[in-house]
Amino acid sequence: HNTTVFQGVEGQSLQVSCPYDSMKHWGRRKAWCRQLGEKGPCQRVVSTHNLWLLSFLRRRNGSTAITDDTLGGTLTITLRNLQPHDAGFYQCQSLHGSEADTLRKVLVEVLADPLDHRDAGDLWVPGESESFEDAHVEHSISRSLLEGEIPFPPTS
């Protein structure tokens, strides 16, 4: 799998999309997990509804939400109120039994807010109390890592 980079601005919302073959993954729940190191496990952040027929319902864990268009074949993850600690490597997964297939590898990059919140003027930034439904979702910038780029740079 190539890694797709999604960039979002600190304090705003980032939407990550993971397309998949709806027939191949028919009846399978999905999950969003965070990769802990290059060889480490992928730690589950949030998964779709327990009942596959209700996968379209938005499920939340903290500031992360997930919803699945099972007929169209698109898993969507929303990271709300993006913070620097949200940056890192993630996976979209398709679950079957105790196994998980990787649908997409994702690198989330968090950019500093170029306006800086104190000088934002009339710019509306969704607060913690506001729901996902109300949150303004910025168009994410995404690209695939170029061949030869190292997803996990070696640590000294």
Epitope: G27, N50, L53, L57, R59, R60, T70, L71
Partner: antibody, heavy 126, light 106 residues
Framework: EVQLVESGGGLVQPGRSLRLSCTAS????????MSWFRQAPGKGLEWVGF??????????EYTASVKGRFTISRDGSKSIAYLQMNSLKTEDTAVYYC?????????????????WGQGTMVTVSS | DIQMTQSPSSLSASVGDRVTITCQAS??????LNWYQQKPGKAPKLLIY???NLETGVPSRFSGSGSGTDFTFTISSLQPEDIATYYC????????FGGGTKVEIK
């Protein structure tokens, strides 16, 4: 008139099988998720399972206590949903209801059930 | 699995009274909650869906509110025909019902 009518209930011995039918009329059957519920005498409501609309190719989901014993199916040409109950237990004794999942105007659905049948009694006893 | 705790289990009120029933979820269920009315010997009837949306044809004296873990169902002015058992139903986890609230007229 939108209507659901259940049939097939009765007295059955533990370990035996029974098939319930739910005949729909007054709406486009294939566009709706159909569900089964049950209510033991003097008790509350319990979801049994449901079957997806035509778009979902009749995919089924069940509550844990009936999984592997009960099977929901549908016949679009007859507008009938079925509940096949095998290996029945005394604790399966209940009034069984079929119900229609509510559709939003934009075409999605919500697991709220807006049309119900009158119910059919299933008694599992030796 | 999510547990739905409905209270009170029964209540008695006079015609015209405001009646309130609560439903508490064991964890956050957003607004994924419905309310039903069941009269003796009859099938349930959907009254409220998505926590606060009134089902078509249901009298406006019925209302629902809440989100997260705490939900409220209200009959603004109790009528004789409202004698029934009322159930909440979540759909965040599976499809679990509360234990029901039996409403009687004083």
């Amino acid at each position: 008139e939108v209507q659901l009518v259940e049939s097939g209930g009765g007295l059955v011995q533990p370990g035996r099988s029974l098939r319930l039918s739910c005949t729909a009329s007054g709406f486009t059957f294939g566009e709706y998720t159909m569900s089964w519920f049950r209510q033991a005498p003097g008790k509350g409501l319990e979801w049994v399972g449901f079957i997806g609309s035509k778009a979902y190719a009749g995919t089924t989901e069940y509550t844990a206590s009936v999984k592997g014993r009960f099977t929901i199916s549908r016949d679009g040409s007859k507008s009938i949903a079925y509940l096949q109950m095998n290996s029945l237990k005394t604790e399966d004794t209940a009034v069984y209801y079929c119900a229609r999942g509510k559709r939003y105007s934009y075409g999605g659905w919500v697991p709220a059930f807006d049309v119900w049948g009158q119910g059919t009694m299933v008694t599992v006893s030796s | 699995d999510i547990q739905m705790t409905q209270s009170p289990s029964s209540l008695s009120a006079s015609v015209g009274d405001r009646v309130t029933i609560t439903c508490q979820a064991s964890q956050d269920i957003t607004n994924y909650l419905n309310w039903y009315q069941q009269k003796p010997g009859k099938a349930p009837k959907l009254l409220i869906y998505d926590a606060s949306n009134l089902e078509t044809g249901v009298p406006s004296r019925f209302s629902g509110s809440g989100s997260g873990t705490d939900f409220t169902f209200t009959i603004s002015s109790l009528q004789p025909e409202d004698i029934a058992t009322y159930y909440c139903q979540e759909y965040d986890s599976y499809l679990a019902f509360g234990g029901g609230t039996k409403v009687e007229i004083k």
